[in-house]
């Protein structure tokens, strides 16, 4: 698993809707793979973390002034939808094929 | 200034090109305002940090399992260009009006 010492990468994060209180309106699935972006954005930033110019600059400044400026952060840079069965306002079970932005597709340094 | 205890916000970060070794090709300006995104992504995530659904989910999971899952991260969500004077292959000073992605326009929780 990706700890603080490892490079920015996508790791598993199973989310149970009951744990976050969303089971009141999401009927199914009971849980889903959300993924999580974990790990550090270390110098030099690799191409696979698709760094912006600002992230590159911040990384270089952090290298020179580590106490003054933080590293870039490993975050989702592309998200995917999931399909959910939910209750609408009338309590009717309705399928939303593309509930956007729920699962990490790619991680990067920002 | 925005510390770890404050909410995610844009703070000043003056970057000197000499400090990061870019003065070899960027002639001017000598320094610029890059800004930095600092502060925490605390529950509940406010609208001004424009959270994605995944960031909201991760924040809720962190609330329940703080040691297992990290908080969302405060990062640049919109970047602005700067203008730079650089030397081309022939050594001719050339102005690039829009050197993209160099300065933070907006921060958010991701």
């Amino acid at each position: 698993s990706a700890g603080a010492g490892s490079h920015c990468q996508k790791t598993s994060l199973r989310v149970n809707f009951e744990d976050i209180g969303w089971d009141s309106w999401i009927i199914a699935p009971k849980e889903y793979e959300a993924y999580e972006c974990k790990g550090g954005c270390f110098f030099p930033l690799a191409d696979d973390v698709t760094p912006t110019k600002h992230a590159i600059v911040q990384t270089l400044v952090h290298l020179k002034f580590p106490t003054k400026v933080g590293k870039a952060c490993c975050v989702p840079t592309k998200l995917s939808p999931i399909s959910v069965l939910y209750k609408d306002d009338m309590g009717v079970p309705t399928l939303k094929y593309h509930y956007e932005g729920m699962s990490v597709a790619e991680c990067g340094c920002r | 200034s925005a510390g770890a205890g404050s909410h995610c916000q844009k703070t000043s970060l003056r970057v000197n090109f000499e400090d990061i070794g870019w003065d070899s090709w960027i002639i001017a300006p000598k320094e610029y305002e890059a800004y930095e995104c600092k502060g925490g992504c605390f529950f509940p995530l406010a609208d001004d940090v424009t959270p994605t659904k995944h960031a909201i989910v991760q924040t809720l999971v962190h609330l329940k399992f703080p040691t297992k899952v990290g908080k969302a991260c405060c990062v640049p969500t919109k970047l602005s260009p700067i203008s730079v004077l650089y030397k081309d292959d022939m050594g001719v000073p050339t102005l690039k009006y829009h050197y993209e992605g160099m300065s933070v326009a907006e921060c958010g929780c991701r």
Partner: antibody, heavy 119, light 111 residues
């Protein structure tokens, strides 16, 4: 070695026309703005016109004193820039330099060619 | 148009001494943290040659005795130590706005 070579100028009567040309070598011509700058004892150094790149749709700009009378053009395939001068006046007399450069500076200069407008 | 006023119009300096030429713009030639000010040297019968760009950066092959400074509206060119080869006309030039304009020039001679 960078070289800019202007065509021979000469004497022309007021109201007359002349076309100057300039051939470049030693650099990638199509990557640079091309300009004409003139010099006279009365007016000193004076930018006349420039033509930008293909990516800028070969946009042109002129000094107010020559607008409507002079036309700058370029042929990237021949690494050449031209200045068509019409309705010439006595105050257009001077040494005409072909210069190449960026959107920031006149980097390369020709040796210049003398244009004399006189009856 | 941005008007550039150079002073003095002519200057005689002893060999080994410092020559200072000033250029004042009718409005600021700075933008984006960049000074759009250049200096050219011209010797008789030759085209101008780029000496200094962006106020303080030396052109290619320019000796270290040539230096530039300033920002906004006030700029200067320094030559130290003065050498015989430095006898020439010197022009400031701005590229912030079209039309790009030149100063009237300063004639530098040896005293």
């Amino acid at each position: 070695e960078v070289k800019l070579e202007e065509s021979r100028g000469g004497l022309v009567q007021p109201g007359g026309s002349m076309k100057l040309s300039c051939v470049a070598s030693g650099f990638t011509f199509s990557n640079y703005w091309m300009n004409w700058v003139r010099q006279s004892p009365e007016k000193g150094l004076e930018w006349v016109a420039h033509i930008r790149l293909k990516s800028d749709n070969y946009a042109t700009h002129y000094a107010e004193s020559v607008r409507g009378r002079f036309t700058i053009s370029r042929d990237d395939s021949k690494s050449s820039v031209f200045l068509q001068m019409n309705n010439l006046r006595a105050e257009d007399t001077g040494i005409y330099y072909c210069t190449g450069g960026s959107n920031y500076v006149f980097a390369f200069w020709g040796q210049g060619t003398l244009v004399t407008v006189s009856a | 148009d941005i008007v550039l006023t150079q002073s003095p119009a002519s200057l005689a300096v002893s060999l080994g001494q410092r020559a200072t030429i000033s250029c004042r713009a009718s409005e600021s030639v700075d933008n984006y943290g960049i000074s759009f000010m250049n200096w050219f040297q011209q010797k008789p019968g030759q085209p101008p040659k780029l000496l200094i760009y962006a106020a303080s950066n030396q052109g290619s092959g320019v000796p270290a005795r040539f230096s530039g400074s300033g920002s906004g509206t006030d700029f200067s060119l320094n030559i130290h130590p003065m050498e015989e080869d430095d006898t020439a006309m010197y022009f400031c030039q701005q590229s912030k706005e079209v039309p790009w304009t030149f100063g009237g020039g300063t004639k530098l001679e040896i005293k």
